[in-house]
């Protein structure tokens, strides 16, 4: 067994804000140190945590894909919110991609709902 330094963790990352865990957990915006003695703040714009936790790493901020716009930037307590660009929408079945909204309704149907970042246009049959 190799004998090493005692608790070097306590001296790590001095640039990050620290506090003490409560019942072994750290508040949103923080992660726990390796020796469970301190809560270390996540790095703004890089990572985050949303709940009380004992994470060794904060969660990495999402980067919006091309075809998406950033609605809310990442903070230490909230992930980035990305939205499909105008004219595209995200389907529940395939949330990883933004699909083009239809430009119009088939013959015999009328548009009742416009394209949104969450849904395609909605068409209903014309009343005869």
């Amino acid at each position: 067994i190799t004998r090493q330094s005692l608790d070097p963790q306590r001296r790590a990352a001095p640039q990050q804000k620290r506090s003490s865990p409560t019942e072994g957990l750290c508040p949103p915006g923080h992660h726990i140190s390796e020796d469970s003695r301190e809560c270390i703040s996540c790095k703004y714009g890089q990572d985050y945590s949303t709940h009380w936790n004992d994470f060794l790493f904060c969660l990495r901020c999402t980067k919006c894909d091309s075809g998406e716009v950033e609605v809310n930037s990442c903070t230490t307590t909230r992930n980035t919110v990305c939205q499909c660009e105008e004219g595209t929408f995200r389907e529940e079945d395939s949330p990883e991609i933004c699909r083009k909204c239809r430009t119009g309704c088939p013959r015999g149907m009328v548009k009742v709902k416009d394209c949104t970042p969450w849904s395609d246009i909605e068409c209903v049959h014309k009343e005869s």
Partner: antibody, heavy 117, light 108 residues
């Protein structure tokens, strides 16, 4: 004095399972995050998995995700690595280590896992 | 993942000489989460340096670490016979934790 003692290694067939244990002493085990690091014969070091002091958070290398499970029993001062669906490329000496991100400041002597038919 | 590239792969030196080992990261790593280890054949690795420049307990002062961002260095000021071994750098800034491939310091 900090001591880490691994056990549970051995010869296993591809697709088989093995459970490694690491008995810890000389420090407040429940306070510290712990890791498993492996070394294939003649190769370098590869981090495998880590767990927080309470056991509430676990982390894995992509190469073992979904096949290996790290856990700990703080009442027994013991760290575990359950290895399922073993492959030839998992053949290595497995080290239990104290720490995760800042450094691995104490290491066990290692236990050899050989996956072969 | 952050890839750590160590150079040279092998360093052939004589006792008493200075050894300079390099560890280059594929993206910036926090100095707080950069460590160096020594490993001899048949033995577990041994922590030398943590936080890029802090010596672990019991490590002789001929070992020193420096660097920041993507470039880190381990220096052994005067090689002793027991220093001939393989040296690894390791980063813990982001998950997954990664090691360099190692630098072997051998007797010339």
């Amino acid at each position: 004095e900090v001591q880490l003692l691994e056990s549970g290694g051995g010869l296993v067939q591809p697709g088989g399972s093995l459970r490694l244990s690491c008995a810890a002493s000389g420090f407040t085990f429940s306070s510290y995050a712990m890791s498993w690091v492996r070394q294939a014969p003649g190769k370098g070091l590869e981090w495998v998995s880590a767990i927080s002091g309470s056991g509430g958070s676990t982390y894995y290398a992509d190469s073992v995700k979904g096949r290996f499970t790290i856990s700990r029993d703080n009442s027994k001062n013991t760290l575990y690595l359950q290895m399922n669906s073993l492959r030839a490329e998992d053949t290595a000496v497995y080290y239990c280590a104290k720490g995760v991100r800042v450094s691995f400041d104490y290491w066990g002597q290692g236990t050899l896992v050989t996956v072969s038919s | 993942e952050i890839v750590l590239t160590q150079s040279p792969g092998t360093l052939s030196l004589s006792p008493g000489e200075r050894a300079t080992l390099s560890c280059r990261a594929s993206q910036s790593v926090s100095s707080s989460y950069l460590a160096w280890y020594q490993q001899k054949p048949g033995q577990a690795p041994r922590l030398l340096i943590y936080g890029a420049s802090s010596r672990a307990t019991g490590i002789p002062d001929r070992f020193s670490g420096s660097g920041s961002g993507t470039d880190f260095t381990l220096t052994i000021s005067r090689l002793e016979p027991e220093d001939f071994a393989v040296y690894y750098c390791q980063q813990g800034t982001t998950h997954p934790i990664t090691f360099g491939q190692g630098t072997k310091v051998e007797i010339k």
